[in-house]
């Protein structure tokens, strides 16, 4: 088979011959160096994950809970390309699983014990098992047979499809269980119907499904969705409260050496040439010898899933959760309030050691992960095998882009009530050497320039959000001659100027010299000729203030600030010469860990914080000798965020807007598998 | 100058104990939490158990009720009591002291510890 083939999975005769017709109209309308399609033949869906897995094969179109199977070991299949619906324009690729209430009923999600529930068929994705999943551990025991479980859990339900006379609690609300349209309450508008009637409770049903029933807006004010936090909200909010977001239909590859470019190739050619109303002898979006072979009858096109996004990214930690416990019938020994210890992702191996060190004497409440970049522990907190980090602003924008959530500040400032006050932020600055006088923020071009690392605040957003309004392209590399930003690509001249060894050269972790607000400044000593950090970094790194011996000599009056105005100050003048005001770092978290890390974080600072005086022999949290592990070493408390408690709303208006901006400069792969999750 | 000097490992069969040693000088010991690490061949050093200046104790899961934590403060001297031994706690075991600083790469020579089945 020729290096460029991709072997197709069919999973019946219908879709074999539909899969032979696929690659006879390939072959005509692409060039002979171009992909090519062959068909493999396989009895199931199973046995077509297995042979792709064993390179008997290469892609299969699978819907979400077999790309699950799929992404299990040995498997280990990833997500390649997704069929989209809807319009090229507003594309929908995945659709949201929601639990439906009426409006005055007044109950919340952790409350459905004894309600009356309308489902829209037994093992069904959406009207049952992300439901059932999710509420698994709160089943009563024994929790096999599932069915008896759910049976014993809600005062009466209809499941259409279940065994009426072996579980009869099931189809109470619908005499008989019916598997088909014939059972009034089937499906998604029946279980819908069967909340609209009042048989049930609450209906457990896609987002759609409300707007396909009430074309009527003052019709759908009268219902409500339950959010996995215990609140509710309005039913078009149904981004921010669902049970989960699950991908409709996907072709999945090996994850190393998968030929992911080879298939995006070939479908993107192929919905060229045989997409929706592009040919008449063959098209990929229609079944005429059955329904949805090969691809779902209803697609409208595909879109390329983004390289960084694995199984666990693209199904959703609710998803995963749900499908997980339905599976694998684990849960906690007993149900507790009590909080399990918070899991802290550390970068590198020198935050692991300090995070060793706060876990033993935290006493059982922190655990330690550990990850080589910020990317890597955001995507592990996403996916639950790492609870909690603190971030600089320009990452806590990744992290909401990515689900996550702001729970307490970094507070910089000294105060009576530090915790119950969050500070407005800290000022983003361009420093340059006194000696270099002639040096302006109107003449960087050319010059060598030091950064904290790409996607930060004062290192990256602030200062190259500001340079591209001037120069309009995203080429700083151009810009500037040389440079230390780690996290740029390892040709880039923007790690030319980095000090780390090997493999270490310009990575955004302190494995790299120049990386962070210190390594940033010891750059500009070093080798640079402005760098881009706090208000506080030379302060704290000159005056013997930094013992290290690049560092112990230095004096403040040999640097100075440069002002957007094209003069410079005193680096005490910040306030009047600075680029912008920066969102203080702040602690993230999944949504469903919000109050665990909020209450257990309290706890520690008020054991380890700034009230520690003698930190050479008690443990500090808030301290690493200059070195910024975990926290910003000059923070004083983390702080309540009251209200602020989105990310936009904890970025604000203004900095969301900038780094927007900057999107279109990001080499962040993980914003790119964010944002396909939620454009 | 810090200098943490480890002893005890050996090559012992699957099922048996060792006792580890480590000597403390140049720290005031007392008032210090230590740890012991291990380091397997092509792998990241992990904590395998750490305590605090109270005596209180943690361990990884891997480890938990098979190996003892210790200190004796009078002789500034850690120690890891481990029994149970299993082939794959072969490592090179080192002790640290966190008051060093967490950014500084300095470990010592740690002390071989061969499992066999």
């Known amino acids: 088979v020729p290096d460029k083939t991709v072997r197709w999975c069919a999973v019946s005769e219908h879709e074999a011959t539909k899969c032979q017709s696929f690659r006879d109209h390939m072959k005509s309308v692409i060039p002979s160096d171009g992909p090519s399609v062959a068909c493999v033949k396989k009895a199931s869906y199973l046995d077509c994950i297995r042979a792709i897995a064993a390179n008997e094969a290469d892609a299969v179109t699978l819907d979400a809970g077999l790309v699950y199977d799929a992404y299990l070991a040995p498997n280990n299949l990833k997500p390649v390309v997704a069929e989209f619906y809807g319009s090229k324009e507003d594309p929908q690729t995945f659709y949201y699983a929601v639990a439906v209430v009426k409006k005055d009923s007044g109950f919340q999600m952790n409350q459905l014990r004894g309600k009356k529930s309308c489902h829209t068929g037994l093992g069904r994705s959406a009207g049952w098992n992300i439901p059932i999943g999710l509420l698994y551990c709160d089943l009563p025991e024994p929790r096999k047979p599932l069915e008896k479980a759910v049976a014993n859990f809600f005062s009466g339900s209809c499941a259409p499809c279940a065994d009426g006379t072996d579980f009869p609690q099931l189809c109470q609300l619908c005499p008989g269980c019916g598997c088909s349209t014939l059972n009034q309450y089937f499906g998604y508008s029946g279980a819908f119907k069967c909340l609209k009637d009042g048989a049930g409770d609450v209906a457990f049903v896609k987002h759609s499904t409300i707007f396909e029933n009430l074309a009527n807006k003052a019709d759908r004010d009268q219902y409500e969705l339950l959010c996995l936090d215990n609140t509710r909200k309005p039913v078009d909010e149904y981004k921010d409260c669902h049970l989960a977001q699950v991908p409709s239909h996907t072709v999945v590859a090996r994850s190393m050496g998968g030929k992911e470019d080879l298939i995006w190739e070939l479908l993107n050619q192929a919905q060229e040439h045989f997409g929706k109303d592009k040919s008449k002898e063959f098209q990929l979006f229609s079944s005429p010898h059955g329904k949805d072979l090969l691809f779902k009858d209803s697609a409208h096109g595909f879109l390329k899933v983004p390289p960084r996004m694995d199984a666990k990214m693209y199904l959703g930690y609710e998803y995963v959760t749900a499908i997980r416990n339905l599976r694998e019938g684990t849960c906690p020994e007993a149900p507790t309030d009590e909080c399990k210890p918070v899991k802290w992702c550390a970068l590198s191996h020198h935050e692991r050691l300090k995070c060793d060190e706060w876990s033993v004497n935290s006493v059982g409440k922190i655990e330690c992960v550990s990850a080589e970049t910020t990317e890597d522990c955001i995507a592990k907190i996403m996916n639950g095998e790492a609870d909690a980090m603190s971030l600089d602003g320009g990452f806590v924008y990744i992290a909401g882009k990515c689900g996550l959530v702001p729970v307490l500040a970094e507070n910089y400032n000294k105060s009576d009530n530090c915790e119950d006050t969050p500070e407005a932020g800290y000022f983003a600055i361009a420093v340059v050497k006194k000696s270099a006088s002639d040096l302006t923020w109107d003449n960087l071009k050319g010059k060598k320039s030091c950064h904290t690392a790409v996607g930060r605040t004062a290192g990256w957003n602030i200062p190259m959000g500001l340079l591209y309004n001037k120069i309009n392209h995203c080429r700083f590399d151009e810009f500037f001659s040389e440079g230390c930003a780690p996290g740029s690509k390892k040709d880039s001249s923007l790690c030319k100027l980095c000090m780390g060894s090997g493999l270490n050269l310009c990575e955004p972790n302190n494995k790299e010299g120049y990386y962070g607000y210190t390594g940033a400044f010891r750059c500009l000593v070093e080798k640079g000729d402005v760098a881009f950090v706090k208000h506080q970094t030379v302060p704290q790194n000159t005056g013997g203030k930094n013992p290290d011996p690049w560092a112990k000599n230095l004096n403040e009056k040999d640097y100075e600030l440069l002002c957007l105005d094209g003069t410079r100050k005193p680096v005490e003048e910040y306030a009047n010469c600075h680029l912008a005001r920066a969102p203080n770092h702040a602690v993230v978290t999944r949504k469903d860990k919000e109050a665990c890390v909020h209450k257990i974080l309290r706890q520690q600072q008020h054991l380890f914080g700034s009230n520690v005086t003698d930190c050479s022999g008690n443990f500090c949290l808030f301290r690493s000798e200059t070195k910024d592990l975990l926290f910003r070493d000059d923070t004083v408390c983390l702080a309540k965020l009251h209200d602020r408690n989105t990310y936009e709303k904890y970025l604000g208006e203004e900095y969301v807007k900038a780094v927007g901006n900057l999107r279109k400069c990001s080499t962040s792969s993980l914003l790119e598998a964010c944002t396909f999750r939620r454009p | 100058q810090v200098q943490l000097v480890e002893s005890g490992g050996g090559l012992v069969q699957s099922g048996g104990s060792l006792r580890l040693s480590c000597a403390a000088s140049?720290?005031?010991?007392?008032?210090?939490?230590m740890a012991w690490y291990r380091q397997a061949p092509g792998q990241q050093r992990e904590l395998v158990a750490g305590?605090?200046?109270?005596?209180?104790?943690k361990y990884a899961d891997s480890v938990k009720g098979r190996f003892t934590i210790s200190r004796d403060n009078a002789k500034n001297t850690l120690y890891l009591q481990m029994n149970s031994l299993k082939p794959e706690d072969t490592a090179v075991y080192y002790c640290?002291?966190?008051?060093?600083?967490?950014?500084?790469?300095?470990w010592g020579q740690g002390t071989q510890v061969t499992v066999s089945s």
């Open positions: 640290t002291d966190y008051s060093r600083g967490y950014y500084q790469d300095y």
């Open positions: 140049g720290t005031i010991f007392a008032i210090n939490t």
């Open positions: 305590i605090t200046r109270g005596g209180s104790t």
